[in-house]
Structures are given as C-alpha cells and as structure tokens.
Interface confidence: low
C-alpha cells in the first residue's frame, strides 16, 4: 500500500538568485487533485495554498514581493491529496544577491585563448568574505566555489570550446547572501571547427536574468494568500 505520494518539483521564477528588494515566485508542482500545498522554509511552515478547483490545478505559486536576507535560505514543499501527503520536494536554495559590494573578475592569461590552454579566473573582493562563487551564464547555471581572504582563484585547467561563454563572480557572505555580480568576462576559446560543433556554448538565460535579473512579476502572481486563514499552519510535519 502506498504511504506517500511522489515528491513535487520546486523552483524559483525567474531565477534562484534574487537581487535584494526584487520579486521572486517560488513554484511548487505536484499532482492534479492536490487539495493543499505547504511551503517550508528552513524547517518550519512558511505558507499554505489550497488550489481551487484542485482537479484542474497541479502547480501553486508563492510570491515574495521584495527579497532580502531574511527570505534567503532553503525551501521545500509538500502537497496532499485527500489525507495522503507527498514526499517533500528537493531543497530549493534561494539566494539574495546585490548585497554590499561588487567583486572584480579577471582571467589569466586573458579572455581570448586557444583550446588546450590553461585558464584561471580570479575573483577579488576587499570586504569581509572568504567564499567566492564563479558562475557561467547558461541554462545549467553551474556554480564553482572558491576560498580566499580577499581573492579566490578558479583554475579551469586546459580549456575546450565548451568553456566558451560569459562568466561572473560573486562574494558570498553566507551560503544564501551574495554580493553584487562582477562585471561579466567573456571567455573566447578558439579551436578547430569539429570541436566547436561538438561542444556548443550553453544556451544563455533570457537577457533579464543577468544584470537586471528580474522583470516585474505578473500581477496574477501577487495573489492574496491570507495566510492566517487556514488551520493547517500548525500541522508541521
């Protein structure tokens, strides 16, 4: 006999990295027929939504009107159909950016290299942080961590054309509070045509994801949850 439902999917729109004071929507997708969704933050209940009609809705949205360090952290969601609860979703790490200062990103030996050359990125920030993050723009949004008092190095090793793309770095004040992004550095890796065709650059995010990051969320997402209007708020699992 099945004791739990499959776990829902959780993600942030438009992105998990949210500049402070900007808007973000946390989405939780479960099953049609789910009568209740709970969003949990750092282990305690954060919000509840009851879709109407449940049989026609399989996704709910929790709107955060202006992001700050208080809202940054780990989120998960669960849903129930009747009395049966789902497994919890994977954890969503929601990060607040544009905190305090802007790091400087540089690349050695330079932004234009040939395939096989060793490349190292350097991220520098003079204020109190010891963790740095290097991100390559693209759908995968791969994050590398580096450590250092005021500067971290990110050796990429011998590069291929797959390393081509735009990079930025952040200083991290804690796991979920990052600095302003550095100015972008575009790495151009030249190589033979065959390699290039085998390893195309990651598809990039829409233009608003970097720099401005966020466009105004549709007013339809700014729904009035009236969070005090439910009894399940103290049914923490």
């Amino acid at each position: 006999q099945q004791q739990t439902l499959p776990k829902p999917f959780i993600w942030a729109e438009p992105h998990f990295m949210v500049p402070k004071e900007k808007q973000v929507t946390i989405c939780c997708q479960g099953n049609y027929g789910a009568v209740e969704y709970q969003l949990h933050f750092e282990g305690s209940l954060f919000a509840v939504d009851r879709p109407k009609p449940p049989e026609r809705i399989n996704k709910v949205q929790f709107y955060i009107p202006d992001m700050n360090s208080r809202m940054a952290g780990q989120y998960s969601c669960i849903y129930r159909v009747g009395e049966l609860w789902s497994e919890p979703s994977n954890l969503l790490d929601l990060v607040v950016t544009e905190m305090y200062d802007t790091p400087t990103l540089s690349v050695h030996p330079g932004p234009e290299v040939i395939s096989g050359e060793k490349v190292t990125f350097y991220c520098r920030l003079d204020t109190a942080t010891s963790m740095f993050l290097l991100l390559k723009e693209g759908r995968s949004s791969h994050v590398q961590r580096g450590y250092g008092k005021v500067q971290a190095e990110f050796p990429l090793g011998p590069v291929t054309t797959a390393h081509r793309g735009t990079y930025r770095c952040f200083g991290s004040y804690n796991n979920h509070a990052w600095s302003f992004p550095s100015e972008p550095v575009k790495l151009l890796v030249t190589g033979d045509i065959e390699n290039t065709s085998l390893a195309p650059e990651d598809p990039t995010f829409p233009a608003d994801t970097w720099g401005t990051y966020l466009l105004t969320t549709e007013t339809g997402l700014q729904k009035d949850h009236a969070l005090w209007d439910h009894t399940a708020q103290n049914l923490l699992r």
């Epitope: 282990g43 305690s44 009107p65 700014q222 009035d224 209007d229 708020q233």
Partner: antibody, heavy 117, light 107 residues
Amino acid sequence: EVQLVESGGGLVQPGGSLRLSCAASGFTFSSYEMNWVRQAPGKGLEWVSYISGSGGSTYYADSVKGRFTISRDNSKNTLYLQMNSLRAEDTAVYYCARVWRFYFDYWGQGTLVTVSS
Amino acid sequence: DIQMTQSPSSLSASVGDRVTITCRASQGISNALAWYQQKPGKAPKLLIYAASRLESGVPSRFSGSGSGTDFTLTISSLQPEDFATYYCQQHYSTPPTFGQGTKVEIK
C-alpha cells in the same frame, strides 16, 4: 527605507470612538499583511488585529472583536483602525506593524490612546 | 491560544556579562519563535526570528536557540545599548502571542 507612521491617537471618553491611521512608505504596501499591536502603560505587547494584503481577510483579538475594524487603502498606502465603544482597558500605545509570515519585521513609533472620563 | 512564558521577568547585569533569557510555549511551536527588543518610549525591534535566525543589522552578540517548547535568547557580552525589555513571540499559529517580557537592567 521602510517607514510606518501612526496618527489619530488622543483622549476619548468611555463609549467613544477613534480612528487610527498608519502611513506606510518604502515598500510595496499592497503586497504585505499588516497588523495593529498595542501596549498598555507598563505592560506587555498584545496583538489586536490583522489584515491581508488586499484587505479581503481580517482577524481580531477576542478582546476587541465587534468593536474594532481594521481596513486599508492600498492606493494611499494607509492602514486604519476604527475603534468604537472604547473602554478604559483599551488605553494603550497602538503600533502598526508589518507582518512577514506571522512575525513583525517593522513597527511604527506608536500612537497613544487614552480612554478616560 | 498558545501561551508564552518568559523567565526571568527582570534581571540585573553588568556590561560584558553573558545574559540568557528563556521562553516557554504552552505547546510545541517547532522553531517558529521571534525575539524583540524594546527600549522605553520606543517601538519593539525584531532581533531574531525562526528561533535562531538573526535579523539583518542585529549585532552577532545576540543569538537564539531552541525548538519545540523551550527557547533561549543569549547576549554573549552585554553592551550599554542592550539594557532594554525583551519579548518572545510565537509565529507558529494565530493569534500571535507574546511573552510578558524580561527587563534587563544595569547592576
């Protein structure tokens, strides 16, 4: 910078009425649930009333239910508390407070309501 | 309603002292507890929420701990500006309820 500024307090006789206002600035007012919290002289904090972002849902402490009405005008970024049938035990400093998931992250400076004959 | 009980109701301490205030809930509230500081004639100020998360801009000498029914606010090294009244508040269910307060006075 988030700012909440209360006004409308004063001296009123038992059975009288008073309307408090709270002018909000520095944040998207309509997106936030708001509350009134009061503090009798020399006493602790007591939650009074809650209103959702749209104004569609309101809640009251048992001690004021039926006498107080919370409302908001999102076009004016203003929160209100209409207090009727006032009693001596309603004497307090009234704070408007922004709520974020059940705790109060920003408070106004408070306005004193004195109910006395 | 969930009842919140703070202890002690007042305490005297010196600058540099480590100060601990406790708060007990009448039923389990997970980690849904906030702490506020209030100085005479001023509005309360949020210090800690979710039992242990420090509000932005609050000095790191303040810390919170606990889960379930028993919670603690600790000031690791009391500073002159810390003499005030401290309140706990459960943000687990409605109505939100406060402890009766703990006044921290200069010894």
